[in-house]
Interface confidence: medium
């Protein structure tokens, strides 16, 4: 039901990235334009984004407010123009999204290897703590804070004139691995929530070799 | 499908150890924290610690720490708890139970009674 | 540690009966808070976990509620196969906490 000038919102997606949350759908709008709400399973609906022609909302900050709760969005049409007009049923038109579960379903970011210092024939590695839009008493949380020991890194690593890949895994942000002495190394990490069924791995992270800036060497 | 196989009842004296098993299936075992939690008869559930399979790292309910050992067998798939010095008040069902993602215990063991008695 | 205080420790209600079990933290544990259903010589089993929501294949007459420290754990229509003690547990801080449990039995 509504009017013959409005379309329903289909294809509605969550796009989350470190807590980061998008919502979009279809379809770009002809002579209407959208409202979003988002509700938890027990809450009421807040709207976001009145009267909006873009075709996605931020809701993060709603979302952040508890990343285990279950939350559930709706994307209401109206006519561009006569956003009080409503469908035959008294309502303007409207499509739901699928439940989104922050904690279980945002996608890992691609993580950044922070540092590596070279002691002898060992490696420290440590991976930038990224920071997330998570609060709590006024502070912004890191991925780390979020997850706690849910979080791991897998650490790959190479000697720069072979391309055999051995890996490392921490629950810190940390890496110490045994090198070659005299050998120059490449990492490359990524962020892994293994007991996850979706969205388990992030993308690797951008490769960082010995003998470039980012390093420090110490010969004891 | 998802399993968890304890060892079998067992029957100690006080100031002995003993050691429980737990063989996993069905899933990756490396990929989820095992937790073991115990229930003295007629009484509720006290968890005792958990053990990474992946790093052999564990945490401790401190109320255990200095009598209890968690560790892991990659190659058999196979969680362990020893408990040591036991005493009668160490009498319980002792079950392995699987945390998933967030920290809710998702499958359990079918429980090993263990029972101290002089 | 976090306490957690579960009340009535025991009840007894009529099949049909809508049945309501309280679980309250010592400090808050967010939505930490999951419920396990555990019959007599059985392991436990998880029902609900983030507060709220239902585990695979747990019927929809079981629901959670609550935030912070307060929570509520419900058995909409009691069935005869319910009877059992339930148990809450924050996973919000370790050591994780279990209630003391409630035995739920039919009049």
């Known amino acids: 039901s509504g009017t013959t000038n409005t379309v329903a919102a289909y294809n509605l997606t969550w796009k989350s990235t470190n807590f980061k949350t998008i919502l979009e759908w279809e379809p770009k709008p002809v002579n209407q334009v959208y409202t979003v709400q988002i509700s938890t399973k027990s809450g009421d609906w807040k709207s976001k984004c009145f009267y909006t022609t873009d075709t996605e909302c931020d809701l993060t900050d709603e979302i952040v407010k508890d990343v285990k709760q279950t939350y559930l969005a709706r994307v209401f049409s109206y006519p561009a123009g006569n956003v009080e007009s409503t469908g035959s049923a008294g309502e303007p038109l409207y499509e739901n999204s699928p439940e989104f579960t922050p904690y279980l379903e945002t996608n890992l970011g691609q993580p950044t290897i922070q540092s590596f210092e070279q002691v002898g024939t060992k490696v420290n590695v440590t991976v930038e703590d990224e920071r997330t839009l998570v609060r709590r008493n006024n502070t912004f949380l890191s991925l780390r804070d979020v997850f706690g020991k849910d979080l791991i890194y897998t650490l790959y690593y190479w000697k720069s004139s072979s391309s055999g890949k051995k890996t490392a895994k921490t629950n810190t942000n940390e890496f110490l691995i045994d090198v070659d002495k005299g050998e120059n190394y490449c990492f490359s990490v990524q962020a892994v929530i293994p007991s996850r069924t979706v969205n388990r791995k992030s993308t690797d992270s951008p490769v960082e070799c010995m003998g470039q800036e980012k390093g420090e060497f110490r010969e004891i | 499908e998802v399993q968890l196989v304890q060892s079998g009842a067992e029957v100690k004296k006080p100031g002995a150890s003993v050691k429980v098993s737990c063989k996993a299936s069905?899933?990756?075992?490396?990929?989820?924290?095992m937790n073991w939690v115990r229930q003295a008869p007629g009484q509720g559930l006290e968890w005792m610690g958990e053990?990474?399979?992946?790093?052999?790292?564990?945490t401790y309910n401190q109320k255990f720490k200095a009598r209890v050992t968690l560790t892991v067998d990659q190659s058999t798939n196979t969680a362990y708890m020893e408990l040591s010095s036991l005493r009668s008040e160490d009498t319980a069902v002792y079950y392995c139970a699987r945390r998933e993602l967030g920290g809710p215990f998702g499958y359990w063991g079918q429980g090993t009674t263990v029972t101290v008695s002089s | 540690s976090i306490q957690m205080t579960q009340s009535p420790s025991s009840l007894s209600a009529s099949v049909g009966d809508r049945v309501t079990i309280t679980c309250k933290a010592s400090?808050?544990?967010?939505?930490?808070i999951a419920w396990y259903q555990q019959k007599p010589g059985k392991s436990p089993k998880l029902l609900i976990y983030?507060?709220?929501n239902r585990y695979t294949g747990v019927p929809s007459r079981f629901s959670g509620s609550g935030y912070g420290t307060d929570f509520t754990f419900t058995i909409s229509s009691l069935q005869p196969e319910d009877i059992a003690t339930y148990y809450c547990?924050?996973?919000?801080?370790?050591?994780?906490?279990f209630g003391g449990g409630t035995k739920v039995e039919i009049k």
């Open positions: 069905g899933y990756s075992f490396t990929g989820y924290y």
């Open positions: 547990q924050q996973d919000y801080s370790s050591p994780w906490t």
């Open positions: 983030f507060a709220s």
């Open positions: 053990i990474n399979p992946s790093t052999g790292g564990s």
């Open positions: 400090q808050s544990v967010s939505q930490g």
